[in-house]
Amino acid sequence: AVNGTSQFTCFYNSRANISCVWSQDGALQDTSCQVHAWPDRRRWNQTCELLPVSQASWACNLILGAPDSQKLTTVDIVTLRVLCREGVRWRVMAIQDFKPFENLRLMAPISLQVVHVETHRCNISWEISQASHYFERHLEFEARTLSPGHTWEEAPLLTLKQKQEWICLETLTPDTQYEFQVRVKPLQGEFTTWSPWSQPLAFRTKPAALGKDT
């Protein structure tokens, strides 16, 4: 692989999934490629087929086991290879040693629900999905609320610097439709990044009581 023409990026969800993206300028869209994972201290290895996601990039998920099984630890090193078919043989395109707990990207939070809603406030809770017990409480969250007439990109980010799976939104407008999203990130890891945003939760504040000053 020539400098600047290819890129291979993978993340571990902290349990049993490594997701990878391989991009290469000038590669044919119908090229058959795969990612092969060889842990240094495990008896298993795993392969996934890279499928096109854009003109010059492919992606796949290495499923290492049951979704909540702890398949790798902080001391594991996984050798990842990109192999592409050339005629009857496979050609190695890239080799990367990958420390899973230095490359974390968790699953998006799930089960968002409105716990309590008032005219100006809304209490929302959520759960983390497929997150390792190794983290204990060493997680942080970001949340954002979509107000009428605005975009998600304009929404200010609310940071929760601890493992707090709820939030009380305040200074909301009565009888108004909102949407809410949250994402999670472990505190450890050289290349650890934010999870995808959760599915948006739609809610509506209660109307102000008639005759009362709001």
Epitope: A1, N3, S6, T9, Q96, D97, F98, E102, N103, E190
Partner: nanobody, 127 residues
Framework: EVQLVESGGGLVQAGASLELSCAAS????????MGWFRQAPGKEREFVAA????????MYAVSTEGRFSCSRDNAKNTVNLLIKNLKPEDTAVYYC????????????????????WGQGTQVTVSS
């Protein structure tokens, strides 16, 4: 900035293993991505391996065939290169290099991406 000194080279039999070491001094080692390159007689310098500042990702030349392993110890200011099952074609001067600019370990860097170089250590593999 850091200074780099390689060690561990020598004359070895084909099939043996060898561990090269690169010691850094005079700077903050953990702020550099580190690489290994080699130059065989009459050939251009070629990429062998590169590791990120924290060692979370390490890229290897496909020609290494899984026989090479690069590791770094930021507490000891060292980066090592273990070569297993040595072959006569591994005969070369092996250079350690440091890169001040950010490297995320997702692509193959060029030798020009590295700004600080050691003097090299000779590895000769006899058949």
């Amino acid at each position: 900035e850091v200074q780099l000194v390689e060690s561990g080279g020598g004359l070895v039999q084909a099939g043996a293993s060898l561990e090269l070491s690169c010691a850094a001094s005079g700077g903050t080692f953990s702020s550099y991505a580190m690489g290994w390159f080699r130059q065989a007689p009459g050939k251009e310098r070629e990429f062998v391996a590169a590791t990120t500042r924290g060692g979370g990702r390490t890229m290897y030349a496909v020609s290494t065939e899984g026989r090479f392993s690069c590791s770094r110890d930021n507490a000891k200011n060292t980066v090592n290169l273990l070569i297993k099952n040595l072959k006569p074609e591994d005969t070369a001067v092996y250079y350690c290099a440091a890169r001040t600019s950010y490297y995320d370990g997702t692509y193959y860097p060029a030798s020009s991406d590295f700004d600080i170089w050691g003097q090299g250590t000779q590895v000769t593999v006899s058949s």
